[in-house]
Interface confidence: low
């Protein structure tokens, strides 16, 4: 639940003064509240695509009208904290990460669409969305509960030279396939054509008298 | 008024000891993370050392000499510091910023300067550590 974060200008914090909007609340809503944070909600687990990007919504629950908002993404992993990417936006405008971030992002309302990029195997871990209302004040702090991202390499690709060893013997191969195959084919077209080649022709008498020039050959095939 | 009162701070010999005090008024003690950072002639502050409901927290430069304790019934941080070099000498401030950033959370992550003191923390007027060889 979101109530009041410590103010800036406003220095003087004794408990009664900052909680009575929560006060309020439990009154009119029967439920405890608790007056640290802004809630930020994040996915639980989130899966890396096959390239290493990796995409999540941080939302959260503004208790003022905030017109500067930053946003940090903050990686937990072994016990040890560090941040991932940081970016201050205007609301309404678009989140501007460093150049060299591996974040981008994009915001609508009390959403960011968070994406982070580049990731590999050891980059697994827990990333949470830390999310400051930084102007007006009072000044609003909220950590989100963290979204597990697992990212798993891909197969890594076989050497180049073993893929053209592989296209040689099998091209090579193939060929000589092809050759023995034609070989093979031919004799056995030869053998099959051998009794038609065999044979003499001879000239006939004709049969006819009037026809004393004119000569038709006829085949004699020789056993 | 939000006040954080340093003491303690002085000459000593390398190899000497010094307890520095923070006592913090104006605010709920229990609502915060406090911390203890240094500041050397031209170099920028850093942290030295946080204590908050989640646990402690020391710069390598510093683990096993210094140890940060608090009594909260005097919203009071204290910072024992033996052993000391010549290297220690610096201004010493004591910082307060909401304890959401807890050591439990983020380990060490709330006695650096991301983490909200710089730009939304309270701050003492320092004490002076001078550690002569």
């Known amino acids: 639940m979101a109530c009041l974060g410590f103010q800036r200008h406003k220095a003087q914090l004794n408990l009664a003064t900052r909680t009575w909007p929560c006060t309020l609340l439990f009154f009119l809503l029967f439920i405890p509240v608790f007056c640290k944070a802004m809630h930020v909600a994040q996915p639980a687990v989130v899966l890396a695509s096959s390239r290493g990007i990796a995409s999540f919504v941080c939302e959260y629950a503004s208790p003022g009208k905030a017109t500067e908002v930053r946003v940090t993404v903050l990686r937990q992993a072994d016990s040890q904290v560090t941040e991932v990417c940081a970016a201050t936006y205007m609301m309404g405008n678009e989140l501007t990460f460093l150049d060299d971030s591996i974040c981008t992002g994009t915001s609508s309302g009390n959403q960011v669409n968070l994406t982070i990029q580049g990731l590999r195997a050891m980059d697994t871990g827990l990333y949470i969305c830390k999310v400051e209302l930084m102007y007006p004040p009072p000044y609003y702090l909220g950590i989100g509960n963290g979204t597990q991202i697992y990212v798993i390499d891909p197969e890594p690709c076989p050497d180049s030279d073993f893929l053209l060893w592989i296209l040689a013997a099998v091209s090579s191969g193939l060929f000589f396939y092809s050759f023995l195959l034609t070989a093979v084919s031919l004799s056995k077209m030869l053998k099959k054509r051998s009794p038609l080649t065999t044979g003499v022709y001879v000239k006939m008498p004709p049969t006819e008298p009037e026809c004393e020039k004119q000569f038709q050959p006829y085949f004699i095939p020789i056993n | 008024q939000v006040q954080l009162v340093e003491s303690g701070g002085g000459l000593v010999q390398a190899g000497g000891s010094l307890r520095l005090s923070c006592a913090a008024s104006?605010?709920?003690?229990?609502?915060?993370?406090i911390g203890w950072f240094r500041q050397a002639p031209g170099k920028e502050r850093e942290g030295v050392s946080c204590i908050s409901s989640g646990g402690t927290y020391y710069a390598d430069s510093v683990k096993g000499r210094f140890t940060i304790s608090s009594d909260n019934a005097k919203n009071t941080v204290f910072l024992q510091m033996n052993s000391l070099k010549p290297e220690d000498t610096a201004v010493y401030y004591c910082?307060?910023?909401?304890?959401?950033?807890?050591?439990?959370?983020?380990?060490?992550?709330?006695?650096?300067?991301?983490?909200?003191?710089?730009?939304?923390?309270?701050w003492g007027q320092g004490t002076q550590v001078t550690v002569s060889s």
């Open positions: 910082g307060a910023v909401s304890s959401l950033l807890s050591v439990e959370r983020f380990p060490g992550g709330h006695c650096g300067p991301r983490y909200g003191y710089y730009r939304h923390g309270y």
């Open positions: 104006g605010f709920t003690f229990d609502d915060y993370a």
